[in-house]
């Protein structure tokens, strides 16, 4: 699998789609993990609604959330109030029993707020009264690694 | 009308190959997995191993992992199972069948091939 | 690989009488699982998907029941043609596996 880099802001909401067959998949939960080192395990973060069928209601994990177009074969992750912790290599998953089927490797990566001057103990964080479908989601920048680019950053 | 035509019966010895094959019509053949499922003579069913035709993605029983092939071919909408050497002890009927899909998932297997007999005996 | 145990293995019944078959699961399946009716000779025929829905064509005098575990065919009222092997199948996981069948005879 080659590896699909999405930028976001920080502090706003990145957008994440992996395309799949939707023949070939169906029937089948997904699931968004976290990658843990280059050849570590894939931790999950949040997975589709157990009924399948009902895979295009949106579900959350903090401030992940995952949705299914089981027909049009897109699943879409939205990483909301995105942080530098956030940055790092996930996996969208296609589940078969306790099998996992990897549909796209993603690099996301966090950029600076450019209009933001604050210091890092100031970044806002949402309220509980502040609902979580208003908030704004900014168009992605992605881009597959160039053959060669190395995901994770050579330790030492 | 969906079907699932397999090719003839078959008679051959020890150490030979085989190819035999499971051609699809009335359906869009690589959009639908495909299942081959092993009778021996007397003896229930036994899954061997799928294939999605759209891309070739297969998956294999342990059992049968090494000891047979299971490819596609969706420009002629056919599977095939192979054996590079036959041993006495794969002497069964080989069923092909398509993996269902229904408005809740998937639908178990809905449509077989009729079967066919593979004799291996010196 | 998940075992599937199937009982009985055989049974014998008359016409009009009620048959059940069980299927039990070595681990949770969902409703992942499906059963096959095949007469000698013949290529097996689906019968119950998704552990309790009927295909188009399938007698209504079979059903199937059960989730988790255990899972259930019933023939209300068996018929002539009705005399065959009764196999279940999971396909939640791969492998995917058969139970080893259920031979339904003529008392």
């Known amino acids: 699998h080659n590896t699909t880099v999405f930028q976001g802001v920080a502090g706003q909401s990145l957008q994440v789609s992996c395309p799949y067959d939707s023949m070939k998949h169906w029937g089948r939960r997904k699931a968004w993990c976290r990658q843990l080192g280059e050849k570590g395990p894939c931790q999950r973060v949040v997975s589709t609604h157990n009924l399948w069928l009902l895979s295009f209601l949106r579900r959350w994990n903090g401030s992940t959330a995952i949705t299914d177009d089981t027909l049009g074969g897109t699943l879409t992750i939205t990483l909301r109030n995105l942080q530098p912790h956030d940055a790092g290599l996930y996996q969208c998953q296609s589940l078969h029993g306790s099998e996992a089927d990897t549909l796209r490797k993603v690099l996301v990566e966090v950029l600076a707020d450019p209009l933001d001057h604050r210091d890092a103990g100031d970044l806002w964080f949402p309220g509980e009264s502040e609902s979580f479908e208003d908030a704004h989601v900014e168009h992605s920048i992605s881009r597959s690694l160039l053959e060669g680019e190395i995901p994770f950053p050579p330790t030492s | 009308e969906v079907q699932l035509v397999q090719s003839g019966a078959e008679v051959k010895k020890p150490g030979e190959s085989l190819k035999i094959s499971c051609k699809g019509s009335g359906y869009s053949f690589p959009s639908y997995w495909i299942a081959w499922v092993r009778q021996m003579p007397g003896k229930g069913l036994e899954w061997m191993g799928i294939?999605?035709?759209?891309?070739?993605?297969?998956r294999y029983s342990p059992s049968f992992q090494g000891q047979v092939t299971i490819s596609a071919d969706k420009s002629i909408s056919t599977a095939f199972l192979k054996w590079s050497s036959l041993k006495a002890s794969d002497t069964a009927m080989y069923f092909c069948a398509r993996q269902g899909i229904e408005v809740t998932g998937t639908g178990g297997l809905d449509v077989w091939g009729q079967g066919t007999t593979v004799t291996v005996s010196s | 690989d998940i075992q599937m145990t199937q009982s009985p293995s055989s049974l014998s019944a008359s016409v009009g009488d009620r048959v059940t078959i069980t299927c039990r699961a070595s681990?949770?399946?969902?409703?992942?699982l499906g059963w096959y009716q095949q007469k000698p000779g013949n290529a097996p025929k689906r019968l119950i998907y998704a552990a309790s829905s009927l295909p188009s064509g399938v007698p209504s005098r079979f059903s199937g029941s059960g989730s988790g575990p255990e899972f259930t065919l019933t023939i209300s009222s068996l018929q002539p043609e009705d005399f065959a092997t009764y196999y279940c199948?999971?396909?939640?996981?791969?492998?995917?596996?058969f139970g080893q069948g259920t031979k339904v005879e003529i008392t």
């Open positions: 294939i999605y035709p759209g891309d070739s993605d297969t």
């Open positions: 681990q949770g399946i969902r409703n992942d």
């Open positions: 199948l999971q396909h939640n996981s791969y492998p995917w596996t």
